[in-house]
C-alpha cells in the first residue's frame, strides 16, 4: 500500500556531489513519526536498505552512512518512511535524489567571456571546455543546490565546450564545471577550477527607458 | 565619430552642489554596450574615477564608494546626454571632471573617448 | 580597491632614445580565465584629456605609431617608447580595469633631455 503517509524529504550531507573514497550522509527525515525508513538506490546495482528512525523534537529521521564513495554507490536515491513493521505499507516516496561521484577526471576549464567583473544587467556566458570528449558539462553554483547541464558541442581547436548562457547578470557568485560521458551519468570529471564572478552597478528603476520622457528622473536605489 | 561635450559652471559654493552635463554625438546614452562615465583629475588625487550609468534593458549606475553617498549620475534621452551632480562640495573637490565613454571593444573600462574637461573650482 | 603605482614620477629622455616607464599594480590584473592583463596606458598633453594609447597591456589602439608598446603580466607592466619624438612630450599614465572602482597611476612625466 504505497503512498498511505505523505512523502519524507532525503538530504545529502555535506552535498551530493562526492569525491571518490570520501564519506556522504544520506538523511531521510519527516514530521510524520516513521519507525522505519527504507533507502532505495537506482544504479549500476538497485538496492534497498532499513534503518530503524530516530524521533526528536516532532521529526523522525534515519542517517544513512556512505563510509568510502565508490562509483557502484552512485545513483539515484529515494527514501520511504513506514509506521508498521509490515515493509510493504510505506509512504510516497521522496523526492529523487542524485548522488554524483565526482574526481574521476581531468578537470574541464571553465571561463567568463565577459572577464572578472560584470556589469548588472549584462548577459553572462560561461565556457566549459576540455581537451577531454566530455558528453556532458554540468555548472554548479554555490549555495545553488541544482546543476545546470548542456551537452558539449562538437571538437573545435582541439576542445569539447559548453556555452551556458546565465542571462542577465543579478549578483556574483562562485561557479565550478564537471563533464561526464553518457554512458555514466553519474561519475563526474575533477572540479575545475572555481570562477568567481563579481557583479557591479544598481538598478535605478526611477530613471526612464529610452522610450520614456527624460523628465521622469530621481535619486538611483542603491542595493549593495 | 563619438565626441562628448561637456558643460556646467565652473565655480560652485563650498556646500552646493556641483553640476555638469555631458553631450553625446555620434553613439547613443541609451547604448546598450557603452558606458557613460565621469572621471575627475587634481594634483592631490590624480585621476579619479567617480561613476557611471548605462542602459542594459533598464538603467543602472555604478559608484566609487569615495563618493557614493553625495553622488547621481543620469542619463537624458531625448537630448541624448548624462549629467553629474555632485552634493556638499569642499575645496577638496575642485578638479578637472570629464566625462568619458568605456567600450565594450577594448574590455569593461577602458575609456576611448573623453569629453574636453571642465576645470570646477570650489570656492570657501 | 587596486593601487596602481608608476615609476618613476619624471623622466628626460633624449630625441631618438628609448624611453621606459614602469607600473606596478598592488595586486594581479591578469584574468587567468581568458589570460588577460587588465591594463590601459594613456598620454595625456597639456590642457587636454587623456588620450588611449594602449589596452589589455600590449595592443595599440589604432592610430598609435608603432614606437609605443606595452609589456609586462600580473602586477608589472612597462610602456616603452622606442626612440622618443617631439610630439611625446607628456604625462603617461597606467590604468587598472580589472575592477571598478577603476584607478589610475600618478603620472609620469616625460621630457626632451
Known amino acids: 500500500h504505497e503512498g498511505v503517509h505523505r512523502k519524507p524529504s532525503l538530504l545529502a550531507h555535506p552535498g551530493r556531489l562526492v569525491k571518490s573514497e570520501e564519506t556522504v550522509i544520506l538523511q531521510c527525515w519527516s514530521d510524520v513519526m516513521f519507525e522505519h525508513f527504507l533507502l532505495h538506490r537506482e544504479g549500476m546495482f538497485n538496492d534497498t536498505l532499513r534503518l530503524i528512525g530516530e524521533h526528536h523534537d516532532g521529526v523522525s529521521k534515519a542517517n544513512f552512512s556512505i563510509s568510502r564513495m565508490t562509483q557502484d554507490l552512485a545513483g539515484t536515491y529515494r527514501c520511504y518512511g513506514s509506521v508498521t513493521h509490515s515493509p510493504y505499507q510505506v509512504s510516497a516516496p521522496s523526492d529523487p535524489l542524485d548522488i554524483v561521484i565526482i574526481g574521476l577526471y581531468e578537470k574541464p576549464s571553465l571561463s567568463a567571456q565577459l572577464g572578472p567583473t560584470v556589469l548588472a544587467g549584462e548577459n553572462v556566458t560561461l565556457s566549459c571546455s576540455s581537451r577531454s570528449s566530455y558528453d556532458m558539462y554540468h555548472l554548479s553554483r554555490e549555495g545553488e543546490a541544482h546543476e545546470r547541464r548542456l551537452p558539449a558541442g562538437p571538437k573545435v581547436n582541439g576542445t569539447f565546450q559548453a556555452d551556458f548562457p546565465l542571462g542577465p547578470a543579478t549578483h556574483g557568485g562562485t561557479y565550478r564545471c564537471f563533464g561526464s560521458f553518457h554512458d555514466s551519468p553519474y561519475e563526474w570529471s575533477k572540479s575545475s577550477d572555481p570562477l568567481l564572478v563579481s557583479v557591479t552597478g544598481n538598478p535605478s528603476n526611477s530613471w526612464p527607458s529610452p522610450t520614456e520622457p527624460s523628465s521622469k528622473t530621481g535619486n538611483p536605489r542603491h542595493l549593495h | 565619430q563619438v565626441q562628448l561635450q561637456q558643460s556646467g559652471p565652473e565655480l560652485v559654493r563650498a556646500s552646493q552642489t556641483l553640476s555638469l552635463t555631458c553631450a553625446i554625438s555620434g553613439d547613443s546614452v541609451s547604448s546598450n554596450s557603452a558606458t557613460w562615465n565621469w572621471i575627475r583629475q587634481s594634483p592631490s588625487r590624480g585621476l579619479e574615477w567617480l561613476g557611471r550609468t548605462y542602459y542594459r534593458s533598464k538603467w543602472y549606475n555604478d559608484y566609487a564608494v569615495s563618493v557614493k553617498s553625495r553622488i547621481t549620475i543620469n542619463p537624458d534621452t531625448s537630448k541624448n546626454q548624462f549629467s553629474l551632480q555632485l552634493n556638499s562640495v569642499t575645496p577638496e573637490d575642485t578638479a578637472v571632471y570629464y566625462c568619458?565613454?568605456?567600450?565594450?571593444?577594448?574590455?569593461?573600462?577602458?575609456?576611448?573617448?573623453w569629453g574636453q574637461g571642465t576645470l570646477v573650482t570650489v570656492s570657501s | 580597491d587596486i593601487v596602481m603605482t608608476q615609476s618613476p614620477d619624471s623622466l628626460a629622455v633624449s630625441l631618438g632614445e628609448r624611453a621606459t616607464i614602469n607600473c606596478k599594480s598592488s595586486q594581479s590584473v591578469l584574468y587567468s580565465s581568458n589570460n588577460k592583463n587588465y591594463l590601459a596606458w594613456y598620454q595625456q598633453k597639456p590642457g587636454q584629456p587623456p588620450k588611449l594609447l594602449i589596452y589589455w597591456a600590449s595592443t595599440r589602439e589604432s592610430g598609435v605609431p608603432d614606437r609605443f608598446s606595452g609589456s609586462g603580466s600580473g602586477t608589472d607592466f612597462t610602456l616603452t617608447i622606442s626612440s622618443l619624438q617631439a610630439e611625446d612630450v607628456a604625462v603617461y599614465y597606467c590604468?587598472?580595469?580589472?575592477?571598478?572602482?577603476?584607478?589610475f597611476g600618478q603620472g609620469t612625466k616625460l621630457e626632451i633631455k
Open positions: 568619458a565613454r568605456d567600450s565594450p571593444s577594448y574590455g569593461r573600462g577602458v575609456f576611448d573617448i
Open positions: 590604468q587598472q580595469y580589472y575592477s571598478p572602482p577603476y584607478t
